[in-house]
């Protein structure tokens, strides 16, 4: 509550997160023309990335384009990209939607469709839907430990969200354990009124707000965090503004003296930890 | 404008960026002693990195040191590093400018010069100038979509920079489309009074400031962002303070059971998105 | 000092860091059943990661699990994980502490112990102590250059911590050179009353606070940074809350048609640069 006689100071904050959990992923894998069921285990080194600061990312879904190499190939026949003659293809043209630079030739993409030939990482990425249900949908059961150290330099006061009395096997619950700083990812979504299974397909951004309302006067000292959760990306966003949350990254390797890459389009949840509040003192 | 009767509250912000564009890179490539013209395509997975938070990086130039291996070799003969006898080389010495630890021997670097032998990733990185013009100078035409979600928790008010009415094929323009949140990188530089082609060589840091001056009173409600741009690195910086923006990273691989790496010195533009402002309410 | 007649404005800040230094690492390496002393050099590309924003990370220690592959194997026999019969192992069970999914069988881990068989990255990571002393303990002598650009938009005032008059070969010292922005990592720890050698083993988080108390009135203008240092992680933290600072990452490769990875558990110091302060003007 506002104490007008107090000198208020904004919080200076540092955050450290640690995600735990393993996911079992089952998907169809094609090798040498034969499709069979692939099964793999993903642990933290596979689904998250060494990140600093107030964010962490958990991959919940992906699309792989394996064995790409720099060469010429027909571009992907997305809507409006097909051609019937070379006139439709402009040498040197880079379509922002495409992944390469046109050579000026119209070539067969498959038995029925022709597209402009491009210089690119080939074969070009297929614009296919993210798998549904999400491949790492079991990430709902992962947990994250959030450590938050705060400082009011003007008041020379420092504290943290984890106290020596806390139990390391707790799980946050709004009513039963509101001070526990180990959160089940599925619970975060439930608290925010969102469906994890649904968001996991395309990805999204989830805010974990940590509010410190600190009274630093010795006679009525109080300084503990309050956690709340809200979705930060716009679930009703128009396709043209790239809904969800995804990014592409590549693993490069050499084969027969040719540089190749596997392109991964990773969908997932970026969790932003937003720390705010004030410390007041007479 | 300042309304003194209002209760002001600083903005809580979350940012999500998405870069689009491909670059055609032509450079001299030496293989088996033969130098020929290499041509390659760079897409987002090649020139940017999965990043969280309020920054994104676009690589605009690079210098590669391929096939390095941990062994002994002469250090690079930069100014003041040459020797004529072993006396000039001190066993165990690590020169902060050098990339290895001296063995105490003075050995030939080439036909005319001798330098101290070091234990290092060899051959050591040549201290050559960044290519001019920049290899990915066409990054000027890349675009970035910036999504910004803001929150005034005390006023329980949330909004975002992208409205449902917006057009996903717009491009920001200070006069014609100041609310569009898709920015051409070259335009950002022009607005900041900087030359993209020049900065792309050594790299730099560019600030994209998003200012929210929000009046949350229902009778005169206004809450839209204002974008402005300014260069954050010091273009007049002394050499000793490392002008521009670059970092080194490595790709590791095994060949004939020996661990090798390709060292990449990546120059580029780091874009910092600086969100600030207040929400005022009676 | 507080000038009540002034209009105060919080600082908008951008940070750029550059770490310098090489480390000599000596460790036991086992190849083909034979253990011998390995010696290697780590430079910035090996011990730090391309990072944005207000943090940088320096790896000071590590544990490697080489040649892991997705298959079946006995899980690591940590406390409470041993079994004597299949009854103790539950098919499909994922123990949060374990790194895989149980098949339901109890199998020999070594000549004396049996554990539940799991589908995982195998052989599973051994839960061994971080090496002591830390492998990159010489990181104490690394230096970091910190560039900080600040802005008070309301006062239309911009400045930076590095002035043209500064000397690029300086080293920060609280008394002799308090404006130098090149810091020796060991000095940062000393200033914060911490022991680098000790923290390097398990890792930790160190705060570098940059305080700008700016009087922007022309008649008594003053705007220079003040640096201070404090440890941000809790050194007395209970084991269950993951003391220190570490994360796991993997290097993937293919051998004999099987995807393999080397898992690295990297311990190190995350440095958080916390910039705060106000600009006041009549």
């Amino acid at each position: 509550s506002d104490k007008l006689y107090q000198r208020k100071e904004p919080v200076i904050s540092s955050v450290h997160t640690k995600v735990k959990g393993i996911a079992e992923v089952t998907e169809n894998v094609t090798e040498g023309g034969v499709t069979k069921l692939g099964h793999s285990i993903f642990d933290t080194a596979d689904y998250t990335f060494p990140l600093q600061g107030n964010s962490f990312f958990v991959m919940t879904n992906y699309v792989k384009s394996e064995g790409q190499v720099q060469t010429l190939c027909p571009e992907y026949p997305r809507r409006g990209a097909q051609c019937s003659s070379d006139r439709r293809c402009k040498k040197g043209w880079m379509d922002p939607q495409s992944k390469g630079i046109q050579t000026g030739r119209c070539v067969p993409y498959d038995k029925t469709r022709k597209t402009c030939e491009v210089s690119a990482w080939c074969p070009t990425e297929e614009e296919k839907e993210a798998p549904r249900p999400a491949l790492l949908r079991s990430a709902e059961n992962f947990t994250v430990l959030i450590k938050n150290n705060i400082h009011f330099p003007g008041h020379n006061y420092t504290t943290r969200n984890i106290l020596p009395t806390m139990n390391g096997s707790c799980t946050f619950h709004k009513t039963w354990d509101p001070q526990c700083s180990i959160f089940r990812l599925g619970d975060i979504f439930q608290e925010a009124g969102e469906n994890f299974t649904e968001v996991a397909v395309q990805g999204g951004i989830m805010g974990i707000e940590i509010y410190w309302d600190c009274n630093l006067d010795s006679w009525s000292h109080h300084c503990r965090p309050r956690y709340s959760f809200r979705r930060l990306d716009d679930k009703n966003m128009d396709e043209s503004f790239v809904p969800g949350y995804n990014f592409r990254y590549a693993k490069y390797y050499k084969e027969n003296n040719v540089e190749k890459r596997t392109l991964i389009k990773a969908f997932g949840i970026r969790f932003d930890i937003l720390v705010f509040g004030t410390g007041g003192k007479f | 404008s300042d309304k003194l009767y209002q209760r002001k509250e600083p903005v809580i912000s979350s940012v999500h960026t998405k870069v689009k564009g491909i670059a055609e890179v032509t450079e001299n490539v030496t293989e088996g002693g033969v130098t020929k013209l290499g041509h390659s395509i760079f897409d987002t997975a090649d020139y940017t990195f999965p990043l969280q938070g309020n920054s994104f990086f676009v690589m605009t130039n690079y210098v590669k040191s391929e096939g390095q291996v941990q062994t002994l070799c002469p250090e690079y003969p930069r100014r003041g590093a040459q020797c004529s006898s072993d006396r000039r080389c001190k066993k165990g010495w690590m020169d902060p400018q050098s990339k290895g630890i001296q063995t105490g021997r003075c050995v030939p670097y080439d036909k005319t010069r001798k330098t101290c032998e070091v234990s290092a990733w060899c051959p050591t990185e040549e201290e050559k100038e960044a290519p001019r013009p920049a290899l990915l100078r066409s990054a000027e035409n890349f675009t970035v979509l910036i999504k910004n979600n803001i929150h005034f928790p005390g006023h329980n008010y949330t909004t975002r920079n992208i409205l449902p009415t917006m057009n996903g094929s717009c491009t920001f323009h200070k006069t014609w489309d100041p609310q569009c949140s898709i920015f051409r990188l070259g335009d950002i530089f022009q607005e900041a009074g900087e030359n993209f082609t020049e900065v792309a060589v050594q790299g730099g840091i560019m600030g994209i400031e998003i200012y929210w001056d929000c009046n949350l009173d229902s009778w005169s409600h206004h809450c839209r962002p204002r974008y402005s741009f300014r260069r954050l690195d010091d273009k007049n910086m002394d050499e000793s303070f490392v002008p521009g923006y670059n970092f080194r990273y490595a790709k590791y691989y095994k060949e004939n059971n020996v661990e090798k790496r390709t060292l990449i010195k990546a120059f580029g533009i780091r874009f910092d998105i600086l969100v600030f402002g207040t929400g005022g309410k009676f | 000092s507080d000038k009540l007649y002034q209009r105060k404005e919080p600082v908008i800040s951008s940070v750029h860091t550059k770490v310098k230094g090489i480390a000599e690492v000596t460790e036991n390496v086992t190849e083909g059943g034979v253990t011998k002393l390995g010696h290697s050099i780590f430079d910035t590309a090996d011990y730090t990661f391309p990072l944005q924003g207000n943090s940088f990370f320096v790896m000071t220690n590590y544990v490697k699990s080489e040649g892991q592959v997705q298959t079946l194997c006995p899980e690591y026999p940590r406390r409470g994980a041993q079994c004597s019969s299949d009854r103790r192992c539950k098919k499909g069970w994922m123990d949060p502490q374990s790194k895989g999914i149980q098949t339901g069988r109890c199998v020999p881990y070594d000549k004396t112990r049996k554990t539940c068989e799991v589908s995982a990255w195998c052989p599973t990571e051994e839960e061994k102590e971080a090496p002591r002393p830390a492998l990159l303990r010489s990181a104490e002598n690394f230096t970091v250059l910190i560039k900080n650009n600040i802005h008070f938009p309301g006062h239309n005032y911009t400045t930076r911590n590095i002035l043209p008059t500064m000397n690029g070969s300086c080293t920060f010292h609280k008394t002799w050179d308090p404006q130098c922005s090149i810091f020796r990592l060991g000095d940062i720890f000393q200033e914060a009353g911490e022991n680098f050698t000790e923290v390097a083993v398990q890792g930790g988080i160190m705060g570098i606070e940059i305080y700008w108390d700016c009087n922007l009135d022309s008649w008594s203008h003053h705007c220079r940074p003040r640096y201070s240092f404090r440890r941000l992680d809790d050194k007395n933290m209970d084991e269950s809350f993951v003391p220190g600072y570490n994360f796991r990452y993997a290097k993937y490769y293919k051998e004999n048609n099987v995807e393999k990875r080397t898992l690295i558990k990297a311990f190190g110091i995350r440095f958080d640069i916390l910039v705060f302060g106000t600009g006041g003007k009549f």
Partner: nanobody, 120 residues
Framework: EVQLVESGGGLVQAGGSLGLSCAAS????????MAWYRQAPGKQRELVAD???????NYADTVNGRFTISRDNVRNTVYLQMNGLKPEDTAAYYC??????????????WGQGTQVTVSS
């Protein structure tokens, strides 16, 4: 039906060399650890060498340095190269594989055995 089919074996003089191979065939998800065991007349079956899917090898003390186990993950085949053979290496050699028919459904499979005889 999953099968392990061995080949190689036969009669060889002491000091000579011999190679065995064993291929897994049928419908399965994944071949995990593969191994060679042997059983001399009147003795218990003993491990000769095993190799994980990640190519980590383990040898019985009696054959270490003389025998080499390897595998080909494309062909789901395990090999045993035996050099410096001794009369005490005479036995029936059995191929073993831990194979997952489906996810988390591993079973142990054995070959029918192949005879190796070392004459002095």
């Amino acid at each position: 039906e999953v099968q392990l089919v061995e080949s190689g074996g036969g009669l060889v003089q002491a000091g000579g060399s011999l190679g065995l191979s064993c291929a897994a065939s049928g419908n399965f998800f994944r071949v995990n650890t593969m191994a060679w065991y042997r059983q001399a007349p009147g003795k218990q079956r003993e491990l000769v060498a095993d190799i994980t899917r990640g190519d980590r090898t383990n040898y019985a003390d009696t054959v270490n340095g003389r025998f080499t186990i390897s595998r080909d993950n494309v062909r789901n085949t395990v090999y045993l190269q035996m050099n410096g053979l001794k009369p005490e290496d005479t036995a029936a050699y059995y191929c073993y594989a831990r194979i997952e028919l489906g996810v988390l459904e591993p079973r142990d499979y054995w070959g029918q055995g192949t005879q190796v005889t070392v004459s002095s």
